[in-house]
Interface confidence: medium
């Protein structure tokens, strides 16, 4: 059954990076509008983007309450200019979503590296902890806070004068590389969850930062931090 | 297939010490945590301690810390639990198990039986 | 550390019977919570993580539910290979901490 003139959403998707969770669905809308609604397996339904005529719908407030548990989206078409009708007894067309859970399926935003700095022939490279939308007593956790040791960073790092590549890995959010004096280096971070079995394990590479260059400067006395 | 092969039954005196190994294969063994699990009749399964194949660094259960020292073998795949000061109470089998993304442990070795006794 | 009370201790029951488990947490572990299934002579298994998701492999007639504190997992039609003994475990706070088991025997 369903309602004259509508159809079903079809092409459910997930899209989600730190936890910013987009549910996107087809077709664009000709004279119909959608409601979504999500749950938990055990949870009650809960309705969002009230009679939209977009195709998609921001599900982060919802997932972010657990980011554990696994969701369920379902998309419903109403006949625009009809919402509100109240003599239908026919129930409007729906389709469900795939299964999503967030801590497993969320992909891993492009990390930045936030500082270097280099004290004789080491360097400390400074990952930047990504805020997400996840909440614990009120305040907004980071990555690192919610992967917790679930979540490595893999550093590439080579001389800017040569392309050979070195791969340095660390469980907190810091390298410390030994490098070799007089030469300046180029770096770049990937976060990786290594237990996930899926396409999703691993980030895009950083934006590439080099010694020499705005973020930082090879000095070879003393500290020197580059933040920005 | 991902397999993690323990070593053999332990027979051992009060005080002496041992280590058991547990050979992982099928997997990349620096992607996951290694766990050590106890079970015994009196206490069913009691968490020992993980250890990060890939970095070394190991956290314990405060109750193990005395007792059980974790290591492991890159070149091998190979994790080790090396236990000391070895009691009656100690005697139990002793599991490696590979922690999942979230915390549970998806894949047990098979158990390494250990017995104190005069 | 996390108090993982599992009841009841044995369960005697018939093939098609239906069973449940429960877990109580001596304080809230979200849904970080697993299930283990352990048969005479072997390791046990891993079936249900996240309260309610089961592991790869595992048949539908295991499910888990829960959040918080209180717990439950669920065979929904025993069959004879069901004999084992069944564990819950939160890995939400280390250390990780196992309920005592419940052990299920067939008629």
């Known amino acids: 059954s369903g309602t004259t003139n509508t159809v079903a959403a079809y092409n459910l998707t997930w899209k989600s990076t730190n936890f910013k969770t987009i549910l996107e669905w087809e077709p664009k809308p000709i004279n119909q509008v959608y409601t979504v609604q999500i749950s938990t397996k055990s949870g009650d339904w809960k309705s969002k983007c009230f009679y939209t005529a977009d195709t998609e719908c921001d599900l982060t407030d919802e997932i972010v309450k657990d980011v554990k548990q696994t969701y369920l989206a379902r998309v419903f078409s109403y006949p625009a200019g009809h919402v509100e009708s109240t003599g239908s007894t026919e129930e409007p067309p729906y389709e469900n979503s795939p299964e999503f859970t967030p801590y497993l399926e969320t992909n891993l935003g492009q990390p930045t590296i936030q500082s270097f700095e280099q004290v004789g022939t080491k360097v400390n490279v400074t990952v930047q902890d990504e805020w997400t939308l996840v909440r614990r007593n009120d305040t907004f956790l980071s990555l690192r806070d919610v992967f917790g040791k679930d979540l490595i960073y893999t550093l590439y790092y080579w001389k800017s004068s040569s392309s050979g590549k070195k791969t340095a890995k660390t469980n907190t959010n810091e390298f410390l590389i030994d490098v070799d004096k007089g030469e300046n280096y180029c770096f770049s971070v990937q976060a990786v969850i290594p237990s996930r079995r899926t396409a999703n394990r691993k980030s895009t590479d950083s934006p590439v930062e080099c010694m020499g260059h705005e973020k930082g400067e090879s000095r070879e006395t003393g500290h020197h931090h580059h933040h920005h | 297939e991902v397999q993690l092969q323990q070593s053999g039954p332990e027979l051992v005196k009060p005080g002496a010490s041992l280590k058991i190994s547990c050979k992982a294969s099928g997997y990349s063994f620096t992607g996951y945590y290694m766990n050590w699990v106890k079970q015994s009749p009196e206490k069913s399964l009691e968490w020992i301690g993980e250890?990060?194949?890939?970095?070394?660094?190991?956290t314990y259960n405060q109750k193990f810390k005395a007792k059980a020292t974790l290591t492991v073998d890159q070149s091998s795949n190979t994790a080790y639990m090396q236990l000391k000061s070895l009691t009656s109470e100690d005697s139990a089998v002793y599991y490696c198990?590979?922690?999942?993304?979230?915390?549970?442990?998806?894949?047990w070795g098979q158990g390494t039986p250990v017995t104190v006794s005069a | 550390s996390i108090v993982m009370t599992q009841t009841p201790k044995f369960l005697l029951v018939s093939s098609g019977d239906r069973v449940t488990i429960t877990c109580k947490a001596s304080?809230?572990?979200?849904?970080?919570i697993a299930w283990y299934q352990q048969k005479p002579g072997q390791s046990p298994k891993l079936l249900i993580y996240?309260?309610?998701n089961r592991y790869t492999g595992v048949p539908d007639r295991f499910t888990g539910s829960g959040y918080g504190t209180d717990f439950t997992f669920t065979i929904s039609t025993v069959q004879a290979e069901d004999l084992a003994v069944y564990f819950c475990?939160?890995?939400?706070?280390?250390?990780?901490?196992f309920g005592g088991g419940t052990k299920l025997e067939i008629k």
């Open positions: 198990a590979r922690r999942e993304l979230g915390g549970p442990f998806g894949y």
């Open positions: 250890i990060n194949p890939s970095t070394g660094g190991s």
């Open positions: 304080q809230s572990v979200s849904n970080g």
């Open positions: 996240f309260a309610s």
């Open positions: 475990q939160q890995d939400y706070s280390s250390p990780w901490t």
